[in-house]
Amino acid sequence: PSGLVTANITDSEALARWQPAIATVDSYVISYTGEKVPEITRTVSGNTVEYALTDLEPATEYTLRIFAEKGPQKSSTITAKFTTDLDSPRDLTATEVQSETALLTWRPPRASVTGYLLVYESVDGTVKEVIVGPDTTSYSLADLSPSTHYTAKIQALNGPLRSNMIQTIFTTIGLLYPFPKDCSQAMLNGDTTSGLYTIYLNGDKAEALEVFCDMTSDGGGWIVFLRRKNGRENFYQNWKAYAAGFGDRREEFWLGLDNLNKITAQGQYELRVDLRDHGETAFAVYDKFSVGDAKTRYKLKVEGYSGTAGDSMAYHNGRSFSTFDKDTDSAITNCALSYKGAFWYRNCHRVNLMGRYGDNNHSQGVNWFHWKGHEHSIQFAEMKLRPSNFRNLEGRRKRA
């Protein structure tokens, strides 16, 4: 015979074809072998011109031989080489599917591999690819979109060889709050790490605001709106700066009175103040907290104290905000000017958390009167807020 070729090669099959001998023959003897694969020999009829090779090993180079027989006579042997395809991984499955995460698992192919190519695509056409190592049989997908259909595909790799892709389809679960209006809703969506998040005032996606969420203190879900920790940020700022906010949300900052007004207008909020100084800690919680709009000069409402720091905010309840360039306090002198800060001053303060960092002069520093008095500037202070009914919401989520 002549012209031996292979076609339709897969990971376990191939079709051998040849041109028949010119003379009439009784039979053809076909043999094939590969590395670490014992030789298989088959005899077929002399009028056959193709033979299906089955049960081949994947990703293996085979040597195929064929010769003709007529009675006791044997023709010369012709040879062809071919390599089977890399077989695919098996049983690709998406498990632990959440709103933004899922776990892909699969069984490895029979052939050895040098890695896997994972491709996952959402219905909107967003495609992501990742290559993982040869010993990997699972991969955690993150940053997925909630309520979205995904197609995940996997292909085994071995050098230049690529297997066929297999796929699975899954749908991420919907977020409880697609546009969380505060850190409590972000937390109820499953975000439990403190850090920067985007919230949407009144749940409006056009009203995005980046905030720092404290997800650990007393159950978490707090929007931090003030942090003092090292004195690097200047808090002796004007009205405009305090209205808009300033500083680095990861470091020292003030979120802004306009933002506080918009947030507390969304519902009933509680205030938490965390204080730390030379290893000592104290806190104050007020179960009613709100900040009025610019027309009220951001009037403070703070009621319902509990905690260990002492109720120093009660003195400031009902007061408008004051800065050195907009004096709304009841003092003849300007409290913000006198004490180099800004606050809901009265005449003047029991709380001066926006005072001069590290200044232990009377009433000048970061003060919380009922904890450390007016002659000790506190090292660390945070003010934060969350919905007053957060405990109920959290319980409902856990039951769900």
């Epitope: 104290y305 109720d311 009660a314 003195y315 003092a331 003849i332 005449n347 003047c348 303060h349 009433s363």
Partner: antibody, heavy 120, light 107 residues
């Protein structure tokens, strides 16, 4: 109209006890701290004791600490002063006073007072 | 405890006079100072809080000033109903202490 009415005063022997009451009306009682202030005959004003709006925090002058106990019943809009181990120097007109805040601050409304006389 | 010292202890004045009473705190108290008026046989009445804020219903002839340790109550034009005893009080810390009082009587 905001009103405070004290009662419970009288003549008592040294070492004995007396309980003063103050009935409040015309305002949301538990939103405000309350106080007792006394005035000995012909003398000035002396703050005696105070209690926060919730009743969770109490405050005393050194002269009455461990002898007097301030308390409140927000459901009944009432303030109390339990006075034990009374001394002659406790003789005074005792005023109940409302604060402007939930914690000790400024006394904006006063009752007319109840007289306590400690004498044998 | 913070000591409050008023001066003078008493003064005689005529209707229409400008009267000034001073109060000194033994330590810095920001503006945590109140003024009360007491007439014989009556309960005290709040006149000024936060050193300079006029209590609702109090005539504008009464005014307060000062900050830190030194404070002043001024009656711009003394009226017959103003003859009384005036007390300052610090609300900075407990115990909340009063001055010894200033008696204003008719000259």
């Amino acid at each position: 109209e905001v009103q405070l009415v004290e009662s419970g005063g009288g003549l008592v022997q040294p070492g004995r006890s007396l309980r003063l009451s103050c009935a409040a009306s015309g305002f949301t009682f538990d939103d405000y701290a309350m106080h007792w202030v006394r005035q000995a005959p012909g003398k000035g004003l002396e703050w005696v004791s105070g209690i926060s709006g919730s009743g969770g925090s109490t405050y005393y002058a050194d002269s009455v600490k461990y002898r007097f106990t301030i308390s409140r019943d927000n459901a009944k809009n009432s303030l109390y002063l339990q006075m034990n181990s009374l001394r002659a120097e406790d003789t005074a007109l005792y005023y109940c006073a409302k604060d402007i805040s939930a914690v000790p601050d400024t006394f904006d409304i006063w009752g007319q007072g109840t007289m306590v006389t400690v004498s044998s | 405890d913070i000591q409050m010292t008023q001066s003078p202890s008493s003064l005689s004045a005529s209707v229409g006079d400008r009267v000034t009473i001073t109060c000194r705190a033994s330590q810095y108290i920001q503006g945590f100072l109140n003024w009360y008026q007491q007439k014989p046989g009556k309960a005290p009445k709040l006149l000024i809080y936060d050193a300079s804020s006029l209590q609702s219903g109090v005539p504008s002839r009464f005014s307060g000033s000062g900050s830190g340790t030194d404070f002043t109550l001024t009656i711009s034009s003394l009226q017959p109903e103003d003859f009384a005893t005036y007390y300052c009080q610090q609300s900075y810390s407990t115990p909340q202490t009063f001055g010894q009082g200033t008696k204003v009587d008719i000259k």
